[in-house]
Interface confidence: low
């Protein structure tokens, strides 16, 4: 077992938040300002991420862990950690490329980011518009047309609109 | 010190493909907080930013101009960036400039290499 | 996206003058503004970054100022090196660059 350990990496005896430095003999160094390593036995540390412009600061950079970034009001986050931002539409927008623009006739959007999604098409689950939609309601279902006839009862409660998709955004 | 060194450019025609090679020395292509990328440069113009890479490999951006037609990438072992140039145009005419870009500002440029599109 | 627009696009002066180049960006930028000096067949070079930092090892005659949408390079004292193409660039938000500013020998 001694044997083992004396022929193990030296650098694999610094902790997070240290790295190898190669300089000083391989003693374990504390990152410098601004740097980080998240796991041990590392021979650099990373440059912290600096959340500027657009971005703003999430969590702090420490010596273990980089800092974390999100988006001034205005705009929201796209990417795996939140890479890029993106510039919010008001709801009853999608974003182009030459800006916010209406959502076009017979579609909607209730967020302000993502793209404009089409009205639920009632007829398809044999139900009759209750609401219409408008640029940033979807429409809400009712009963079918054959339930409101007359001597039927019409207490049943509309569905519930439907829930937006969950494509990337 | 920082060096960055392009190579593969040549003449090419429309509709054809490239691939751009950027060697880097001095520093690691992958250092965590450092982005590179390339530039382009047409003719007697001015500059335009092309694509770039995140210092960790995970983010990779695009100019609208090229998207779905550039892919960067790069190899750590061998800390050299790669630009593959596909259906290329034109107007894709330039010098193409590999950059470090040290949270905004592109502080490290290599010479370029000259991408002529034409039949 | 995000346009910078310089002006002039061009200018002649002699060795000595005081020479002023602005960039206007079309939305607020803070102070995420480059500038750049390229000579022919050459790549850009860094000068100033954010707005108002002299980039390590470019003389003091060059400055930087601006936030917001309106930003400056100023070179207090024309040298015979200095006569080249400016450009500013954008740090806010992805890349972009101005159109370029030449400075030409009068």
């Known amino acids: 077992f001694e044997r083992t350990r004396s022929l193990q990496d030296p650098c694999s005896n610094c902790p997070a938040g240290t790295f190898c430095d190669n300089n000083r003999n391989q003693i374990c160094s504390p990152c410098p300002p601004n740097s980080f390593s998240s796991a041990g036995g590392q021979r650099t540390c990373d440059i912290c991420r600096q959340c500027k412009g657009v971005f703003r600061t999430r969590k702090e950079c420490s010596s273990t862990s980089n800092a974390e970034c999100d988006c001034t009001p205005g705009f929201h986050c796209l990417g795996a950690g939140c890479s890029m931002c993106e510039q919010d539409c008001k709801q009853g927008q999608e974003l182009t490329k030459k800006g916010c623009k209406d959502c076009c006739f017979g579609t909607f959007n209730d967020q302000k980011r993502g793209i404009c999604r089409p009205w639920t098409n009632c007829s398809l689950d044999g139900k009759s518009v209750l609401v219409n939609g408008t640029k940033e309601r979807d429409v809400v279902c009712g009963p079918s047309p054959a339930d409101l006839s007359p001597g039927a009862s019409s207490v049943t409660p509309p569905a519930p609109a439907r829930e937006p998709g969950h494509s990337p955004q | 010190e920082v060096q960055l060194v392009e190579s593969g450019g040549g003449l090419v025609q429309p509709g054809g493909s490239l691939r751009l090679s950027c060697a880097a020395s001095g520093f690691s292509l992958s250092t965590g907080g450092v982005a590179v990328g390339w530039i382009r440069q047409a003719p007697g113009k001015g500059l335009e930013w092309v694509s770039g890479i995140s210092g960790d490999g995970g983010t990779t951006y695009y100019a609208d101009s090229v998207k779905g037609r550039f892919t960067i990438s790069r190899d750590n072992s061998k800390n050299t960036l790669y630009l593959q140039l596909n259906s290329l145009r034109a107007e894709d005419t330039a010098v193409y400039y590999c950059t470090r870009e040290d949270y905004g500002p592109h502080a490290y440029w290599g010479q370029g290499t000259l991408v002529t599109v034409s039949s | 996206d995000i346009q910078l627009t310089q002006s002039p696009s061009s200018l002649s002066a002699s060795v000595g003058d005081r020479v002023t180049i602005t960039c206007r960006a079309s939305?607020?930028?803070?102070?995420?503004l480059n500038w750049y000096q390229q000579k022919p067949g050459k790549a850009p070079k860094l000068l100033i970054y954010d707005a108002s930092n002299l980039e390590t090892g470019v003389p003091s005659r060059f400055s930087g100022s601006g936030s917001g949408t309106d930003f400056t390079l100023t070179i207090s004292s024309l040298q015979p090196e200095d006569f080249a193409t400016y450009y500013c660039?954008?740090?806010?938000?992805?890349?972009?660059f101005g159109q370029g500013t030449k400075v030409e020998i009068k």
């Open positions: 939305q607020s930028i803070t102070t995420y």
């Open positions: 660039q954008q740090s806010y938000s992805y890349s972009t």
